[in-house]
């Protein structure tokens, strides 16, 4: 669950469950820098437009970001 | 599985201090913001304060901004509750409750302690 | 400030169907997802629906949960009405998030 930006990290939970791709908007990764010193990984979901927040170190989540940058880079001429 | 006990409570006069703790297993405490919520005798629920997982947000009701501390020991898988300058009106039960992994609602409640703020 | 309504109390036979309202004030209900706790006399309160009408394992299917934007509310509707149905049902919403709101609670009586 994501805040805005002006507050230093910007989850108030992380979940090592990976999300549905059908269901995702937009998936954000957030680097470290001197605001929050953890990368951050957002999941926008297309329904109400929720953001949840995904553990970087789970490897479920890992997985999730290969097979989204794997459907992003057969997209891309 | 998954449990939340919360302690600390007692009878405290006003403008004196507490502070409630609530010790949590079975899930993966380092990764799970948690809510303190109350509730007044015979009344209903009332949100508190809110922390995130690894302690660096903290957001709190109005009505305890300033005289309430929210904040976590990932270590002891604790999460505590600093109450100060403490009123008639905080009087109630409170309750830890875990949001779930996934989502936006609490999925796991303590059984609640009691503070009775009463001169 | 976002704020929910109910009403304060509700009665119904076993076997009947219930209707609870929450109803928003100061934003739009819709905006965010809405979520129901149920809570027994001297007990904690549990899930019985969130993410306005996704019902938790465990949760029997004669729960649902319902979003209405032209009212702007949230109805938590209970069908074939057993006594242990008995308890006070709060909704929950934010205002906005991380910031929490609850209902004021609406106490149900099986007659």
């Known amino acids: 669950v994501p805040l805005s930006r002006t507050v230093r990290c910007t989850c108030i939970s992380i979940s090592n469950q990976p999300v549905n791709p059908r269901s995702l908007e937009k998936l954000e990764i957030i680097p470290a820098s001197q605001f929050c010193p953890r990368v951050e990984i957002i999941a926008t979901m297309k329904k109400k437009g929720e953001k949840r927040c995904l553990n970087p170190e789970s490897k479920a989540i890992k997985n999730l970001l290969k097979a989204v940058s794997k459907e992003r880079s057969k997209r891309s001429p | 599985q998954v449990q939340l006990v919360e302690s600390g409570g007692g009878v405290v006069q006003p403008g004196r201090s507490l502070r409630l703790s609530c010790a949590a297993s079975g899930f993966t405490f380092s990764n799970s913001g948690i809510h303190w919520v109350r509730q007044a005798p015979g009344k209903g629920l009332e949100w508190v304060a809110v922390i995130s997982y690894d302690g660096s947000n903290k957001f709190y009701a109005d009505s305890v901004k300033g005289r309430f501390t929210i904040s976590r020991d990932n270590s002891k898988n604790t999460l505590y509750l600093q109450m100060n300058s403490l009123r008639a009106e905080d009087t109630a039960v409170y309750y830890c409750?875990?949001?779930?992994?996934?989502?936006?609602?609490?999925?796991?409640w303590g059984q609640g302690t009691l503070v009775t703020v009463s001169s | 400030n976002f704020m929910l309504t109910q009403p304060h109390s509700v009665s119904e036979s076993p076997g009947k169907t219930v209707t609870i309202s929450c109803t928003g004030s100061g934003g739009s209900i819709d905006r965010n997802y809405v979520q129901w706790y149920q809570q027994r006399p001297g007990s904690s309160p549990t899930t019985v629906i969130y993410e306005d009408n996704q019902r938790p394992s465990g949760v029997p299917d004669r729960f649902s949960g319902s979003i209405d934007s032209s009212s702007n509310s949230a109805s938590l509707t209970i069908s074939g009405l057993k006594t242990e149905d008995e308890a006070d049902y709060y909704c929950?919403?934010?205002?906005?998030?991380?910031?929490?709101?609850f209902g004021g609670g609406t106490k149900l009586t099986v007659l």
């Open positions: 929950q919403s934010y205002d906005p998030l991380p910031v929490w709101v």
């Open positions: 409750a875990k949001l779930r992994d996934n989502g936006e609602y609490l999925d796991y």
